[in-house]
């Protein structure tokens, strides 16, 4: 079943390569287990950036080597992606799945365009 997911259209990452945004889903029921996946679309290719499954009321747990961290509050997931470089500029799509209890719901946002600017190199000093 389909579910609405909202996320900002455009975000500029910080000069340290960190971008945070909220992914909000309109939960039709009382889900206890939710899976959040961040997909990156660039030049027509879609790749998975990170994913986490969490129990409502608990923290999101990404893999140890993940570039993502996140917190949840109700139907909102606050996602942070770090270690971004200019080459990582692209459309980051939030996919939310309500895993349990049934029925299963799937929602995919329109994506957040994350622009990443590599810091200017410092001029050499004498």
């Amino acid at each position: 079943k389909a579910m609405h997911v909202a996320q900002p259209a455009v975000v500029l990452a910080s000069s340290r390569g960190i971008a945070s945004f909220v992914c909000e889903y309109a939960s039709p029921g009382k889900a206890t287990e939710v899976r959040v996946t961040v997909l990156r679309q660039a030049d027509s290719q879609v790749t998975e950036v990170c994913a986490a499954t969490y129990m409502m009321g608990n923290e999101l747990t990404f893999l140890d080597d993940s570039i993502c961290t996140g917190t949840s509050s109700g139907n909102q997931v606050n996602l942070t992606i770090q270690g971004l470089r200019a080459m990582d500029t692209g459309l980051y799509i939030c996919k939310v799945e309500l895993m349990y209890p049934p029925p299963y719901y799937l929602g995919i946002g329109n994506g957040t365009q994350i622009y990443v600017i590599d810091p200017e190199p410092c001029p050499d000093s004498d």
Epitope: P8, A9, L12, T89, L91, Q113
Partner: antibody, heavy 117, light 108 residues
Framework: QVQLVQSGAEVKKPGASVKVSCKAS????????ISWVRQAPGQGLEWMGW????????NYAQKLQGRVTMTTDTSTSTAYMELRSLRSDDTAVYYC??????????WGQGSLVTVSS | EIVLTQSPGTLSLSPGERATLSCRAS???????LAWYQQKPGQAPRLLIY???SRATGIPDRFSGSGSGTDFTLTISRLEPEDFAVYYC?????????FGQGTKVEIK
């Protein structure tokens, strides 16, 4: 409909500052960015920089760094561009534009800033 | 900085003719981040094409964009009287975002 309405024309003396406003309507202001572009009389378009309204992060053109500041007031859905230490070659029409995933649309109607002693 | 060079500087054509405008980048540009704008005297620019080839809302299908890498083209299949204007390309691929110097399409 989505609209950006800018403040009126200004005449400034060299060395002074100017602050141009851009009021947005018809969309969720915090979801997009606002870019500023200027056009000197009879010349082409020059990108000045932009602000990510969602988090307030900014990216300025190198040549204006230190003289330009872009801010927003989310309570009134208004973006501002302040340019300091004005020179005669800053005389231009200043445009704001909504930044989407890979476009500027729409644009404000433009604000003429004249720098003259 | 990515420099965009537009050619020709001026294009003199008659209504009904085909216009081909070129935009060449000094470095490779992701086609996702190349746009075209139209500007008429005394007016703000208007988005025509984004992502190198996608028409903006309300833009007639006589306008089309193509290209990749360093070479991009805006084509107007049959010029209408209202199409005589200045056209700019712009890249968002790398900061600073830059515009071409513009191509003026004038009535012959």
């Amino acid at each position: 409909q989505v609209q950006l309405v800018q403040s009126g024309a200004e005449v400034k003396k060299p060395g002074a500052s100017v602050k141009v406003s851009c009021k947005a309507s018809g969309y969720t202001f915090t979801s997009y960015g606002i870019s500023w572009v200027r056009q000197a009389p009879g010349q082409g378009l020059e990108w000045m920089g932009w602000i990510s309204v969602y988090n307030g992060n900014t990216n300025y053109a190198q040549k204006l760094q230190g003289r330009v500041t872009m801010t927003t007031d989310t309570s009134t859905s208004t973006a501002y561009m302040e340019l300091r230490s004005l020179r005669s070659d800053d005389t231009a029409v200043y445009y704001c534009a909504r930044v989407g995933a890979n476009w500027f649309d729409p644009w404000g109607q433009g604000s003429l800033v004249t720098v003259s002693s | 900085e990515i420099v965009l060079t537009q050619s020709p500087g001026t294009l003199s054509l008659s209504p009904g003719e085909r216009a081909t405008l070129s935009c060449r980048a000094s470095q490779s540009v992701s086609s996702s981040y190349l746009a075209w704008y139209q500007q008429k005297p005394g007016q703000a620019p208007r988005l025509l094409i984004y992502g190198a080839s996608s028409r903006a809302t309300g833009i007639p299908d006589r306008f089309s964009g193509s290209g990749s890498g360093t070479d991009f083209t805006l084509t107007i299949s049959r010029l209408e009287p209202e199409d005589f204007a200045v056209y700019y390309c712009q890249q968002y691929s790398r900061s600073p975002w830059t515009f071409g110097q513009g191509t003026k399409v004038e009535i012959k």
